[in-house]
Interface confidence: medium
C-alpha cells in the first residue's frame, strides 16, 4: 500500500534570465528512494539514481544543474521554460510517486516566488 505523499514547491514564478530551484519531498513512507526523475512534458531533464549518481540529459546540460539534494536547478530561464515539471520518485517497495510543479517565467523583474521549503 502506498502511504507516502509528495510535497512540492507548487506553482512558482521566476524572472527571465534568472534561475529557480525545483524541489520535491517524499514523506509519510519508509520506502527507499531508488531513483528520482525530473521531467518536463515527456522530456527527461535529469535522473538522480541512488547507486549511480546524477545524469543530466545532454540537451539540457548547459542550463540544468543537479541539486540541492534531490532537487534540480534551472538556470538562464527563458519564457519557453514556462510549464509543468514533474518529479517522479521510484521507491521500493511502494512503487512510483509523482509530484507536479508549475513554473511561470516572467518578463517582469518583479516575479514573486511561490512558497519555498527546506528539504531536511
Amino acid at each position: 500500500m502506498m502511504t507516502g505523499t509528495i510535497e512540492t514547491t507548487g506553482n512558482i514564478s521566476a524572472e527571465k534570465g534568472g534561475s529557480i530551484i525545483l524541489q520535491c519531498h517524499l514523506s509519510s513512507t519508509t520506502a527507499q528512494v531508488t531513483q528520482v526523475n525530473w521531467e518536463q512534458q515527456d522530456q527527461l531533464l535529469a535522473i538522480c539514481n541512488a547507486d549511480l549518481g546524477w545524469h543530466i540529459s545532454p540537451s539540457f546540460k548547459d542550463r540544468v544543474a543537479p541539486g540541492p539534494g534531490l532537487g534540480l536547478t534551472l538556470q538562464s530561464l527563458t519564457v519557453n521554460d514556462t510549464g509543468e515539471y514533474f518529479c517522479i520518485y521510484h521507491t521500493y517497495p511502494d512503487g512510483t510517486y509523482t509530484g507536479r510543479i508549475f513554473l511561470e517565467v516572467l518578463e517582469s523583474s518583479v516575479a514573486e516566488h511561490g512558497a519555498r521549503f527546506q528539504i531536511p
Epitope: T34, Q35, L44, I47, N49, A50, D51, L52, G53, W54, H55, I56, S57, P58, K61, A65, P66, H90, Y92, T96
Partner: antibody
Framework: DVQLVESGGGLVQPGGSLSLSCAAS????????MNWVRQPPGKALEWLGF??????????EYSASVKGRFTISRDNSQSILYLQMNALRAEDSATYYC??????????WGTGTTLTVSS | DIQMTQSPASLSASVGGTVTITCRAS??????LAWYQQKQGKSPQLLVY???TLAEGVPSRFSGSGSGTQFSLKINSLQPKDFGSYYC?????????FGAGTKLELK
Amino acid sequence: DVQLVESGGGLVQPGGSLSLSCAASGFTFTDYYMNWVRQPPGKALEWLGFIRNKANGYTTEYSASVKGRFTISRDNSQSILYLQMNALRAEDSATYYCARSTAWYFDVWGTGTTLTVSS
Amino acid sequence: DIQMTQSPASLSASVGGTVTITCRASEHIYSYLAWYQQKQGKSPQLLVYNAKTLAEGVPSRFSGSGSGTQFSLKINSLQPKDFGSYYCQHHYGNPLTFGAGTKLELK
C-alpha cells in the same frame, strides 16, 4: 564523427598488470560517464565499471568482480579513458570495450582490444 | 545484484520472418532496459533504451516493449543484416548487468 578506439591489449602472464587506453573523439568528453565492458570469447558482455563526468566529480564505480584489482581513470585534456588492470587471472581474458553512457545505457562503443592472460 | 535472464539462448529464422526475444529481470526495473545487437567480431550497437525507445538510426522493424520485470524485443521483416547476437541490459542500478545473449541464426 563520434568515435572510441581502444588500445593496449596483448598477452600477459597470470599475476601481471596491463593498462588499456581508449581515445575518444567527436564529442565533449567531460560531459559523459565512460565505462569499460568486457566479453570473454564466445560469452556474454560484462560491465566492469565507470568513471563519472565532470558534473559528478569524475568519481568511479566498479563491479564486484574487478573491484580492488582494476582502476578506471581519465585524462580529460586528451580525451583518453584508461583501465589499469592488476593481479590478472586467466578468467580476465576477453575483448575489452570502452563505452560512453547516457543515463547508464551504452550509446557509443569502441572497437575493442583483446587481452589474453596465459602462462 | 539484478540478474537478467534472456530467452531463448538461440533461435533460427528466415529472411522476411518475425522473431521475439524476451528478457526477465530478477527485480522490478520500471522501464530501464536496453537492447543491443552484436555481429560476429564486431562491437555491440545500441538498439533500444528505456524499454521501447529506438536509438538513433535503428529501423522501425525493431520494437521493444515491457516494464517491471518482463521485456521483449521484436524484429519484423527480418533482413540478412539482422542475424547476430542480441543482449539486454538493465540501466537502473549498480551493478549494470547484461543478459547472457540470444543468438539469431539464418534458417
